[in-house]
């Protein structure tokens, strides 16, 4: 429906609190380097303007689009050129090109300092002194570091963040109460950001059709009792929501997400029996709960798919006359029968089916040609099954840290040109698949593992896109969204890679390593491991293990020494020499 004033419409729908929070998120995701105070000032100005439009929708400028209003506001920032360089050129453009320009300048890896968590008492004091500013700061810091974070979901995180401080700052042991909650929010937040980043990449790099196919498969698994028309409606609405959020239209996105949650709850009888608890919650919790809801039970009496999609001699007629409906129905029917498959596998099967029909429907005897199409699915299903089986066995044998190290070595050998911090981050996340998914029974392992790997490999793709260094990474990232994981799995050692020059500084460590958390210490060691492989790509597992064991012993020894710094200097030289000898450097 057309509204005289879009900004007034959204202000009224969302309420002042959510309106202000979402505008802050939007601005922080666009101008990631701007100080907090500058953003708060801009948000307050926009909010005051919105209120004038609520009072009189015909007031001056109230009829302008949100992109125009927000873009004009962002372009008032005085230090735009100094801080952002060529992004300032966006301001010379007209809408919608200006917004597209801002979107293109979003930085997945902004040069921002690591967020250091203050002492609990310091945080609690800040929370009590000015709760509103404290929570705004949280939104700002997350949004600027995660420019594609799903905005309505960030509101949910902020609500939980506030609840944690409200509860724990009154507790007897504030730290024991608060720190686990903050750790959980941090880990969940990173996972949420990465999942949303894949949705945005899917829409922006592969188009709406790719996202819709993903959504049909996932929703059909989740709501197998829902009929095709219902799933199609949900897919259309969900696509609109994510298109808006990925496009920076955060007010529309949050509003439409609320409408979608309302619709789902009003129609839960025809969608899923698992929604009851979700639908009793307040809005933000409700939307989050629906997004995470477990798969409903498969309906009884589902006949074989072969009859309609393989055995029928009219397959080509149905395909030719109603391509999208026919393929959509195939994906829906296959997915609702296979909660045990990953979404990407289901999409590979659908693509194989489509390719077979394209070929066979032009053949002399189409039915004879496509009669064995389901046989082509067998190797596609077995490949991820076998890979997951092997890797879960390896994980159970090694434990998470050593499993991550095995993946670090594997991926560094595949794509050694990629920066060491990216290889460490991505391989650590790939390694987390073990503890996340291997505990599940067989029927849940593949959807857990392969769909998680898709999210992690997308991190590699977006980070690599910023500064491309490897044609192999570019190829795996751009050729096919659903075949990214098999593409990376199939990569062997890069024989064209010229080993990195040895630099002793890379392997020089200091006493500060002793005060690091276990996680930070692991990252230091894993960074050294990647560098080692880059210097000696042909090193065997045994050689690398020996060096890493020596390294661990060296750190342990020096951290126990009285004069730690001297120990690191002297023993470090010996370790480097011994490692060079062991690896033949």
């Amino acid at each position: 429906d057309a509204h005289k004033s879009e900004v007034a419409h959204r202000f009224k729908d969302l309420g002042e609190e959510n309106f202000k929070a979402l505008v802050l998120i939007a601005f922080a995701q666009y101008l990631q380097q701007c100080p907090f105070e500058d953003h708060v000032k801009l948000v307050n100005e926009v909010t005051e303007f919105a209120k004038t439009c609520v009072a009189d929708e015909s007031a001056e400028n109230c009829d302008k689009s949100l992109h125009t209003l927000f873009g004009d506001k962002l372009c008032t920032v005085a230090t735009l050129r100094e801080t952002y360089g060529e992004m300032a050129d966006c301001c010379a453009k007209q809408e919608p090109e200006r917004n597209e320009c801002f979107l293109q300048h979003k930085d997945d890896n902004p040069n921002l300092p690591r967020l250091v968590r203050p002492e609990v008492d310091v945080m609690c004091t800040a929370f009590h002194d000015n709760e509103e500013t404290f929570l705004k700061k949280y939104l700002y810091e997350i949004a600027r570091r995660h420019p594609y974070f799903y905005a309505p979901e960030l509101l949910f995180f902020a609500k939980r963040y506030k609840a944690a401080f409200t509860e724990c700052c009154q507790a007897a042991d504030k730290a024991a109460c608060l720190l686990p909650k903050l750790d959980e929010l941090r880990d969940e937040g990173k996972a949420s950001s990465a999942k949303q980043r894949l949705k945005c990449a899917s829409l922006q790099k592969f188009g709406e059709r790719a996202f819709k196919a993903w959504a049909v498969a996932r929703l059909s698994q989740r709501f197998p009792k829902a009929e095709f028309a219902e799933v199609s409606k949900l897919v259309t609405d969900l696509t609109k929501v994510h298109t808006e959020c990925c496009h920076g239209d955060l007010l529309e996105c949050a509003d439409d997400r609320a409408d979608l949650a309302k619709y789902i709850c009003e129609n839960q009888d025809s969608i899923s029996s698992k929604l009851k608890e979700c639908c009793e919650k307040p809005l933000l919790e409700k939307s989050h709960c629906i997004a995470e809801v477990e798969n409903d039970e498969m309906p009884a009496d589902l006949p074989s798919l072969a009859a309609d999609f393989v055995e029928s001699k009219d397959v080509c007629k149905n395909y030719a006359e109603a391509k999208d409906v026919f393929l959509g129905m195939f994906l829906y029917e296959y997915a609702r029968r296979h909660p045990d498959y990953s979404v990407v596998l289901l999409l590979r099967l659908a693509k194989t089916y489509e390719t077979t029909l394209e070929k066979c429907c032009a053949a002399a005897d189409p039915h004879e040609c496509y009669a064995k199409v389901f046989d082509e699915f067998k190797p596609l299903v077995e490949e991820p099954q076998n890979l997951i089986k092997q890797n879960c066995e390896l994980f159970e044998q090694l434990g998470e840290y050593k499993f991550q190290n095995a993946l670090l070595v594997r991926y560094t050998k595949k794509v050694p040109q990629v920066s060491t911090p990216t290889l460490v981050e991505v391989s650590r996340n790939l390694g987390k698949v073990g503890s996340k998914c291997c505990k599940h029974p067989e029927a849940k392992r593949m959807p857990c593992a392969e769909d998680y790997l898709s999210v992690v490999l997308n991190q590699l793709c977006v980070l690599h896109e910023k500064t491309p260094v490897s044609d192999r990474v570019t190829k795996c990232c751009t050729e096919s969204l659903v075949n990214r994981r098999p593409c990376f799995s199939a990569l062997e050692v890069d024989e064209t890679y010229v080993p990195k020059e040895f630099n002793a500084e890379t392997f020089t460590f200091h006493a500060d390593i002793c005060t690091l958390s276990e996680k930070e210490r692991q990252i230091k060691k894993q960074t050294a491991l990647v560098e080692l492989v880059k210097h000696k790509p042909k090193a065997t597992k045994e050689q690398l293990k020996a060096v890493m064991d020596d390294f661990a012993a060296f750190v342990e020894k020096c951290c126990k020494a009285d004069d730690k710094e001297t120990c690191f200097a002297e023993e470090g030289k010996k370790l480097v020499a011994a490692s060079q000898a062991a690896l033949g450097l």
């Epitope: 006949p303 074989s304 072969a306 029928s312």
Partner: antibody, heavy 120, light 107 residues
Framework: EVQLVESGGGLVQPGGSLRLSCAAS????????MNWVRQAPGKCLEWIGH???????YYATWAKGRFTISRDNSKNTVYLQMNSLRAEDTAVYFC??????????????WGQGTLVTVSS | FELTQSPSSLSASVGDRVTITCQAS??????LAWYQQKPGQPPKLLIY???DLTSGVPSRFSGSGSGTDFTLTISSLQPEDFATYYC??????????FGCGTKLTVL
Amino acid sequence: EVQLVESGGGLVQPGGSLRLSCAASGFSLSSYAMNWVRQAPGKCLEWIGHINAGDIAYYATWAKGRFTISRDNSKNTVYLQMNSLRAEDTAVYFCARGAGGFSTGPFKLWGQGTLVTVSS
Amino acid sequence: FELTQSPSSLSASVGDRVTITCQASESINSRLAWYQQKPGQPPKLLIYDASDLTSGVPSRFSGSGSGTDFTLTISSLQPEDFATYYCQGYGGSSTTTFGCGTKLTVL
């Protein structure tokens, strides 16, 4: 409640026309292949045709030309247009839902049927 | 294709084991359904894909066969089982065919 209700049956003269309706409730008709089946008094079940989710209609060989199946998704209703009716078309006409959007069977959901009598 | 059901009528007693057959004029793989119909009612689906029992149907009903020869078995007849039974072949194309029924009556 998920159900199908046929209507539009009655007495018609030979050579006349009749349009039967099948109204669906509790589900969206556009998700399924919707079938028409008839049964002459004391006789076998006879499939007439169906319209699938791609809006493609298929007919039994004997029904082609005289019978037309269509649907209106906004009304959640499927129709059977019958022309040049003969005495042998006298039967109870059932509407039945296919298992999926492109299914010719099996039919788990049936209407109660509407009686068509062709007589002068 | 055509479906030939036999026998066309059958008399039996409560507790009897009853078998009805359906033969297709060409292979229909496992795409055969069995229905039960009582006077003044629409047919009720009992078995689909030759041997899969529809939820809510008593386990005394079972189906078997593939290709061209199919069987419906009622292991121990109950009073409510006296009715007409139809087979239906589907899936080979976008058309479907019914057999002409087997009327099961009390002996």
